[in-house]
Interface confidence: low
């Protein structure tokens, strides 16, 4: 059976070595194995981790678990059938769902967020759906670096 | 498809002339990955229509250079035409630049299926007149 000549790559993608971002005149270059789209860089994992493991993997690459500006943000992969951990967790202190940078979840982003179990973490499908799952479950994850 | 190949090969493939506001000199709404720009289409087209659509965007119908790229594209999009075809089931599969395509394409024994599709980490043959999502690529 023929298959593609393998490069010297890991069996599953993980964020690459910590490369300083190279700016060009009006935008950016992303690290190897990261996707550039609308002046953001995204790492889309193919391996599954718990929510905390995902958060730490993103942090180790000077990025954070995906914080969505709007449901069109991942338009380029809206055909994907997968769910991915994103950087949303429930804060007992603020009694609100907060992104990793401390900002509150817009009620317009996920209309069903009121039904989310506050003990769970949020997995997102790029066509706009979100669901809450045990934070110990393993999912793929998306890291994001905002570049401008 | 072969009549279009000639026309396609004579096309200019200079993506840098397009508006390049986004990462790594790619046109707006394209994505960058590993020194290439990709247009992730959502429209369904026949294989020949897809070929022409990519040519009109100064790029090529999706080519896949290695397993890593195939894995990445399968994460981004479940299926897409690729720039591989054959003139009939008696002819070899070839790429857009006329080179023999050596990798396995499923269902190759079906004489009606003469254009190739990437589908979730595998390559399959399909009817060239089918309406399938297409992606374009330009190497930086």
């Amino acid at each position: 059976k023929n298959s593609f000549t393998k490069l010297s790559i890991e069996p599953a993608f993980t964020p690459g070595p910590n490369i300083e971002l190279q700016k060009d005149s009006d935008c950016c270059s992303c690290q190897e194995k990261w996707v550039g789209y609308r002046c953001n860089c995204y790492f889309i994992s193919s391996e599954q981790k718990t929510w905390n493991e995902s958060r730490h993997l993103c942090a180790s690459q000077k990025s954070s678990l995906l914080q969505l500006q709007n449901t069109d943000e991942l338009d380029f992969m809206s055909s994907s059938q997968q769910f991915y951990w994103i950087g949303l967790s429930y804060s007992e202190e603020h009694t609100a769902w907060l992104w990793e940078n401390g900002s509150a979840l817009s009620q317009y982003l996920f209309p069903s967020f009121e039904t989310f179990n506050t003990k769970n973490c949020i997995a997102y499908n790029p066509n706009g759906n979100a669901l809450d799952e045990s934070c110990e479950d393993k999912n793929r994850y998306i890291c994001k670096q905002q570049l401008i | 498809p072969s009549t279009l190949i000639q026309r396609h090969n004579n096309s200019s493939l200079n993506t840098r002339t397009q508006k390049a506001r986004h990462c790594g000199h790619c046109p707006e709404e394209w994505i960058t990955y590993s020194n290439s720009c990709y247009y992730i289409g959502k429209e369904r087209r026949t294989w020949e229509e897809s070929l022409l659509a990519c040519t009109s965007k100064n790029s090529s119908l999706l080519s896949i250079d290695n397993e890593e790229e195939m894995k990445f594209l399968s994460i981004i999009s479940p299926s897409s035409w690729i720039g591989v075809f054959r003139n009939s089931s008696h002819h070899p599969w070839v790429t857009m630049n006329g080179l023999a395509f050596k990798h396995e394409i499923k269902d190759s024994d079906n004489a009606e299926l003469n254009c190739a599709v990437l589908q979730v980490n595998r390559l399959k043959s399909a009817q060239c007149g089918s309406s399938i999502i297409y992606h374009c690529k330009h190497k930086l």
Epitope: - | R44, S79, Q127, G129, S131
Partner: antibody, heavy 124, light 107 residues
Framework: EVQLVESGGGLVQPGGSLRLSCAAS????????IHWVRQAPGKGLEWVAS????????DYADSVKGRFTISADTSKNTAYLQMNSLRAEDTAVYYC?????????????????WGQGTLVTVSS | DIQMTQSPSSLSASVGDRVTITCRAS??????VAWYQQKPGKAPKLLIY???SLYSGVPSRFSGSRSGTDFTLTISSLQPEDFATYYC?????????FGQGTKVEIK
Amino acid sequence: EVQLVESGGGLVQPGGSLRLSCAASGFTFSSYYIHWVRQAPGKGLEWVASISPYDGYTDYADSVKGRFTISADTSKNTAYLQMNSLRAEDTAVYYCARSSDFSPWTSSGGMDYWGQGTLVTVSS
Amino acid sequence: DIQMTQSPSSLSASVGDRVTITCRASQSVSSAVAWYQQKPGKAPKLLIYSASSLYSGVPSRFSGSRSGTDFTLTISSLQPEDFATYYCQQYGSSLRTFGQGTKVEIK
């Protein structure tokens, strides 16, 4: 010769269950999409569900989602439609059909081969 | 879901007539439309796929065309065996849908 043969239809009470089978022969089963399409007496065609036997990808019409389950056994070249919580409006002739499969989200042409159909009657 | 609105629901025609049946998709399905013929008590038969491709073994008097989201089945010269019900079907969406059908009767 390509053949699709349905079986398993019959009379069932509302709320009951039934499993239809579609035995395929004469083609490479896993290279095609298998569909169930139904036709209520004197009415038009309604697509019910689809499966890609190669990877098990399924789709359902909203009218049956959660009640019907489509599956396939590639070792037996057979597709199934498990129908639960049946209602009077599910009464129809159920056909299985195939179409070329190149992606879980589209099929390459129409449904080129059909079975002869099996009648499902839901009545008390 | 994508709706396929088919018209007319029935028509009367004579042998030799040119018959046109139309289907309008509620949103874009590209060329992913098929046409079928069905006779009473029988399974449907595929006539046209990809909007305009004639399925093998189907007489050339049948043809299909597309204009945007409008699809047309034309029978150039109606034959006695063509009296039947015709359906359009879209497969541009994973949730496939059929038109309501057009019954072609003898005038």
